[in-house]
């Protein structure tokens, strides 16, 4: 299973609750042999995904995988919604699965959901 | 290889909790899904939910909502199934299962907990 | 919820035999990375049930060659080229697509 292939760390339909107001580090393990390559992040609208030019990000490198991270200063309630990292290496484009963002606005919640009910009910989270 | 240890039997009685353990090894949690199935007596599979022990997440089930809850220790790579207000319809071989988060690699099932509810 | 429909619900083949399971799904099983997540599993007598086959046809490690999977759309079938005695057992299709995952109500595969 190990390889000199570029592998993206995403788990297939991964989920997070979020707060908007709150920040947060969606992050996107790379790992690669030689040469790091170029990652960026999208935000998916229906089937297209919408390349995120002018956002923060940064690296973060360990031992055995590096991350390209998003960065939410601090999380707004319209970044709900799925994103996908693509890396650019040897003219191949590969593509995470996509991870979804369920943004709670709390201002608008009369009261903070549980952390049980942001789990089981997303489709409270965004009012 | 990857493995998973669930705790033993149990009988309850109508209306009370259980909580079933299940170990894994071979495999950093994190980096799967883990999910509980049931089969009654004689019957079918039925999914109860799941959890990303990466980051607590867990579905269920609708008919489980509220009624299950599935949690995770990533310090001891072990899962939780908890069912409240048991009745006699919940008797069953209770299973979890884990796999592989990113590609697939694995499906492994735990050798089953028998859950009896009976007054 | 998704629903998937086994056919038959049970059948009897002789030793070296070959034996075909069908499943249907009342939704398209591709996620949005373009794949079908659905798999089979094998349930012999007294034990968990153990995958054998995930993405419709790739073979999981140690499974023997006689099992394949095929299928796309909502149709999906599983054969055994030539049944074993060890074959007995009830095989479930399942979604991996959609929450709530389901499974197929379970095919008897029995030794005539």
């Known amino acids: 299973k190990e390889s000199c292939d570029v592998q993206l760390y995403i788990k297939r339909q991964s989920e997070h609750s979020i707060l908007a107001g709150d920040p947060f580090e969606l992050e996107c393990p790379v790992k690669y042999c030689a040469n790091r390559p170029h990652v960026t992040w999208c935000k998916l609208n229906g089937t297209t995904c919408v390349k995120l030019e002018d956002r923060q990000t940064s690296w973060k490198e360990e031992k055995n995988i590096s991350f390209f991270i998003l960065h939410f200063e601090p999380v707004l309630p319209n970044d709900n919604g799925s994103y996908r990292c693509s890396a650019n290496f040897q003219s191949n484009l590969i593509e995470s699965h996509s991870t979804t963002l369920y943004v709670t606005d709390v201002k608008s919640a009369s009261e903070r959901p549980s952390k049980d009910e942001m789990a089981s009910r997303p489709w409270l989270l965004y009012r | 290889q990857v493995q998973l240890v669930q705790s033993g039997a149990e009988v309850k009685k109508p209306g009370s909790s259980v909580k079933v353990s299940c170990k894994a090894s071979?495999?950093?949690?994190?980096?799967?899904?883990m999910y509980w199935v049931r089969q009654a007596p004689g019957q079918g599979l039925e999914w109860i939910g799941r959890?990303?022990?990466?980051?607590?997440?867990?579905r269920y089930a609708q008919k489980f909502q509220g009624r299950a809850t599935v949690t995770a220790d990533k310090s001891t790579s072990t899962a939780y199934l908890e069912l409240s207000s048991l009745r006699s319809e919940d008797t069953a071989v209770y299973y979890c299962?884990?796999?592989?988060?990113?590609?697939?690699?694995?499906?492994?099932w735990g050798q089953g907990t028998t859950v009896t509810v009976s007054s | 919820d998704i629903v998937m429909t086994q056919s038959p619900d049970s059948l009897a083949v002789s030793l070296g035999e070959r034996a075909t399971i069908n499943c249907k799904s009342s939704?398209?099983?591709?996620?949005?990375?373009?794949?079908?997540?659905l798999n089979w599993l094998q349930q012999k007598p007294g034990q968990s049930p153990k995958r054998l086959i995930y993405?419709?046809?790739k073979l999981d490690s140690g499974v023997p060659d006689r099992f394949s999977g095929s299928g796309s759309g909502t149709d999906f079938t599983l054969t055994i080229s030539s049944v074993q005695a060890e074959d007995v057992a009830v095989y479930y299709c399942?979604?991996?697509?959609?929450?709530?995952?389901?499974f197929g109500q379970g095919t008897k595969l029995e030794i005539k």
């Open positions: 993405l419709v046809s």
């Open positions: 939704q398209s099983l591709l996620d949005s990375d373009g794949k079908p997540y």
């Open positions: 071979g495999v950093n949690i994190k980096d799967t899904y």
């Open positions: 299962a884990v796999n592989d988060g990113y590609f697939e690699y694995f499906d492994v």
């Open positions: 399942w979604q991996d697509t959609h929450f709530p995952r389901t």
């Open positions: 959890i990303d022990p990466a980051n607590g997440y867990a």
